[in-house]
């Protein structure tokens, strides 16, 4: 006899990276017929939802209207059908961004390179942080972590055309509180064949559409959040 129900899915809309004072919704999807959902934050009960009518609802939303450092951290959810509880969901790391300062991102030898060249990104922030994060914009939200007193190096090694795209970096004050994003740096990698078009599976965006990027990233998740690439989430743990 089954003692627990399958774990629900948890995700954040529009994104798990939330600028301070902006809104975010944590979604928890369980099963139709669930009579109660519980959202837990850092191991403590955060909120409860009892859907009405339960047989017509399989997803609930927990709204955070004003993101701040107190709301940043690890969330999970569970649901109940009758007296039977589910396994807990995976952990959702909710990150508050736009804290304190803005780092500077640079690339060596430059933003336009030939396939096979060694490329290194440098993220610099003069305030009190020793952890840095480099993100490549696009659906899979690739994140690299680096360390340094005021600057971190991110060696990409010999690059291929797959490295083409727009990069930003953050200073991290703790796992869940990040700085403002740096200005974007667009890396252009020219292959043997003269073709400088961007890889279609990894779209990039102009400097003023970081918010659009976040929404676009999450759109892929909404289509099938079970298959979403959790690279960025796992890196936080």
């Amino acid at each position: 006899q089954q003692q627990t129900l399958p774990k629900p899915f948890i995700w954040a809309e529009p994104h798990f990276m939330v600028p301070k004072e902006k809104q975010v919704t944590i979604c928890c999807q369980g099963n139709y017929g669930a009579v109660e959902y519980q959202l837990h934050f850092e191991g403590s009960l955060f909120a409860v939802d009892r859907p009405k009518p339960p047989e017509r609802i399989n997803k609930v939303q927990f709204y955070i209207p004003d993101m701040n450092s107190r709301m940043a951290g690890q969330y999970s959810c569970i649901y109940r059908v009758g007296e039977l509880w589910s396994e807990p969901s995976n952990l959702l790391d909710l990150v508050v961004t736009e804290m304190y300062d803005t780092p500077t991102l640079s690339v060596h030898p430059g933003p336009e390179v030939i396939s096979g060249e060694k490329v290194t990104f440098y993220c610099r922030l003069d305030t009190a942080t020793s952890m840095f994060l480099l993100l490549k914009e696009g659906r899979s939200s690739h994140v690299q972590r680096g360390y340094g007193k005021v600057q971190a190096e991110f060696p990409l090694g010999p690059v291929t055309t797959a490295h083409r795209g727009t990069y930003r970096c953050f200073g991290s004050y703790n796992n869940h509180a990040w700085s403002f994003p740096s200005e974007p740096v667009k890396l252009l990698v020219t292959g043997d064949i003269e073709n400088t078009s961007l890889a279609p599976e990894d779209p990039t965006f102009p400097a003023d559409t970081w918010g659009t990027y976040l929404l676009t990233t999450e759109t892929g998740l909404q289509k099938d959040h079970a298959l979403w690439d959790h690279t960025a989430q796992n890196l936080l743990r």
Epitope: T25, S44, F46, V48, K52, F62
Partner: nanobody
Framework: QVQLVESGGGLVQAGGSLRLSCAAS????????MGWFRQAPGKEREFVAA????????HYADSAKGRFIISRDNAKNTVSLQVNSVNLEDTAVYYC????????????????????WGQGTQVTVSS
């Protein structure tokens, strides 16, 4: 913006009952989950009870189950907490709080999830 003002506190004898009220200003009261918290001398603020924006869903701390009843009147912008069989451990400052929710059936439990707080009303239980 929501302003919250608690009332109904004071001195009460052990074994008696009291009713705390919280008046909210603003036209969006019916969109907020409302909660009661309390803070005893030398202790952290603790959750007591909460009610969803629709009033259909309530949630109580284990220590509050059975003796406490939370209710709301969206027409009057008020939320109340009835406390029965009060005991010395109920001595505390009681706070009303409001949390904006996406769904009418959500109650917020964690203090971090509340956007607005009242100034509190003191309840003192005498033996």
């Amino acid at each position: 913006q929501v302003q919250l003002v608690e009332s109904g506190g004071g001195l009460v004898q052990a074994g008696g009952s009291l009713r705390l009220s919280c008046a909210a200003s603003g036209r969006t009261f019916s969109r907020y989950s409302m909660g009661w918290f309390r803070q005893a001398p030398g202790k952290e603020r603790e959750f007591v009870a909460a009610i969803s924006s629709s009033g259909d869903v309530t949630h109580y701390a284990d220590s509050a189950k059975g003796r406490f009843i939370i209710s709301r009147d969206n027409a009057k912008n008020t939320v109340s907490l009835q406390v029965n069989s009060v005991n010395l451990e109920d001595t505390a400052v009681y706070y009303c709080a409001a949390s904006l929710t996406a769904r009418a059936t959500t109650v917020t439990v964690h203090p971090n999830g509340y956007n607005y707080w009242g100034q509190g009303t003191q309840v003192t239980v005498s033996s």
